[in-house]
Interface confidence: low
């Protein structure tokens, strides 16, 4: 009976050993599968995150497009109204003009002498820009960049005058130090009778026939 028990015990030990090995193998297999599943989960997760990011970006882009469309529709209907009303009243800015504080501004990308720039603005039912405040100055500078740009200020007929009749003496001024100086040393004949923004935004007087960029301005009528 003892020998039988010994055999049974040996058999049990063997079975247990086999079971342990088998269990370890299964655990290892499960662990490998788990890692694989984990990796796949991470992959799916990152794909989902990317898709979500893309969707958010698409949504933002779509919102921008919708806003732009709404703005364009408003602008177009306003243009149509202005067109039907023979352009006598303007409650919105023409296309490609920028609205700021009740005025519309157009920034040239080409260059012309002051007189030609002035004529151009007049043909657009506007005038060369008249700068009346520090805020307007900053707004213009943000849109122009560091470029010499004509403004609607000249002393060709005597004292300095704004083209729209705004009072020069009591109004906003932003000359560079020692300007205007009516400099004759340029050798182009005469002095300097037209004002422009210099690269840092302060004003200088220069020879009117120099070709610089320019800005046109027109006031918006109050909407009823």
């Amino acid at each position: 009976q003892n020998s039988q028990l010994r055999e049974d015990l040996l058999a049990l030990r063997q079975n247990f050993s086999n079971l342990t090995v088998s269990t370890e193998d299964q655990v290892k297999a499960l662990s490998t599968q788990g890692s694989s599943v984990g990796r796949k989960m991470k992959l799916v997760e990152s794909k989902l995150e990317k898709q979500q990011k893309d969707l958010t970006e698409d949504h933002s882009s779509l919102l921008l497009h919708v806003k732009q469309l709404v703005s364009d529709v408003r602008s177009l209907s306003c243009q149509m109204a202005a067109f039907r009303g023979n352009g006598s009243e303007r409650t919105c800015c023409p296309i490609n003009w920028v609205e700021y504080e009740g005025s519309c501004y157009w920034f040239s990308s080409s260059v012309r002498p002051w007189t030609e720039a002035d004529k151009y603005c007049q043909l657009e039912n506007a005038h060369l820009v008249v700068v009346t405040s520090r805020d307007e100055q900053n707004f213009l500078q943000r849109h122009m960049g560091p470029l010499n740009t004509w403004i609607g200020l000249t002393d060709q007929n005597g004292p300095w005058k704004w083209v729209d009749g705004t009072d020069y003496e009591t109004g906003f001024q932003n000359w560079r130090p020692e300007q205007p100086d009516n400099w004759y040393g340029h050798g182009l004949g005469g002095g300097e009778d037209c004002a422009h923004f210099t690269t840092d935004g302060r004003w200088n007087d220069d020879v009117c026939r120099r070709p610089y960029r320019w800005v046109c301005e027109t006031k918006l009528d109050k909407a009823n």
Epitope: N138, Q141, G145, P146, N174, T198, T199, D200, G201, R202
Partner: nanobody
Amino acid sequence: EVQLLESGGGLVQPGGSLRLSCAASGFTFNDYDMGWVRQAPGKGLEWVSDISSTGRATYYADSVKGRFTISRDNSKNTLYLQMNSLRAEDTAVYYCAKMNGKYYDDPFDYWGQGTLVTVSS
């Protein structure tokens, strides 16, 4: 990367002269107006002079007019400040500065490390 490196500072007697230089790199030098600004010990920044991109137009603070001359050599990307008839009150750290062409009430966007000018007997 914009870099402005001043040199030429030092100790000088009243009535003496110095020439400051500023070597510029990292941007198209001849596209921008440049200037000099100084800071005396315990004082705020004081605009000294600036010069247009071409070098045609130059501007000076009243305190240095007739004594200082700003100039530039666009072929060497270098800005200069010739200082004559120096006075004790000219003692300061002198900074070379690039004008940003954007906001008139803060016209400088890059500054050098500065060079110290001491006027003393």
